[in-house]
Amino acid sequence: PEPPTACREKQYLINSQCCSLCQPGQKLVSDCTEFTETECLPCGESEFLDTWNRETHCHQHKYCDPNLGLRVQQKGTSETDTICTCEEGWHCTSEACESCVLHRSCSPGFGVKQIATGVSDTICEPCPVGFFSNVSSAFEKCHPWTSCETKDLVVQQAGTNKTDVVCGPQDRLRA
């Protein structure tokens, strides 16, 4: 028979034949052959693999470093990574929670809707049309664009959510 060019779900192609992938929580020891099944082995303590795979090494569980203010929110298993969170009163800097800050800053293009309290983190909001923020800040609101008209100037460059408008002199009509 013709060797396969594609395999079913949860299989992979090797040496012109389809082998079963290892299930989550297990790593590949040896590929299948014409006569043998794929050989898989469970991940060790503090290791995981979260997908059907052909990996020869399991991934290490994330370490929640207490020196960075991190603690374990959910212990990892052979199929899932450890989930870290921050100590009480501190906030993760990202979804991956790799470090902790007292309160998060709002990125350029966003302003502070509510300053952090002892209980809640900073609440950010996107700067609407007519407003901008060009800094990362835990305190600053979006600023309104400069009104060129009130300075008897015209808009030379439009503002964005991250930049103010640029004003310039009115074009003088030539005689």
């Epitope: 020196n67 100590e87 800097t93 470090s99 007292l102 309160h103 800053s105 305190f139 600053e140």
Partner: nanobody
């Protein structure tokens, strides 16, 4: 390496005043939003006041509004906190920091004790 060294703390009577200073180095000071935080005995960190890089915008926690004034001298890379009408509940170790204030670097604080 970022270095932040707070000084100016001490023992003061209720109603008294103190001026804290913070010497900063290892980063571009005028570009950074700066913050004062404090930790009272047995309590967590509480933000007290913050100031924009230019010094044009200042922010205060409700507990110190009208009593404390934050300022900065960008030519000296120094942050200040003028504390007036001090109360017993202002007793804490005060730390300065740059935003975002990271868990792994607080710098050296200065102890303020308000007591008669």
């Amino acid at each position: 390496e970022v270095q932040l060294l707070a000084s100016g703390g001490g023992l003061v009577q209720p109603g008294g005043s103190l001026r804290l200073s913070c010497a900063a180095s290892g980063f571009t000071f005028p570009q950074e939003e700066m913050i004062w935080v404090r930790q009272a005995p047995g309590k967590g960190l509480e933000w007290v006041s913050a100031i924009s890089g230019s010094g044009g915008s200042t922010y205060y926690a409700d507990s110190v509004k009208g009593r404390f004034t934050i300022s900065r001298d960008n030519s000296k890379n120094t942050l200040y906190l003028q504390m007036n009408s001090l109360r017993a509940e202002d007793t804490a170790v005060y730390y300065c920091g740059k935003e975002p204030f990271r868990y792994d670097y607080w710098g050296q604080g200065t102890l303020v004790t308000v007591s008669s």
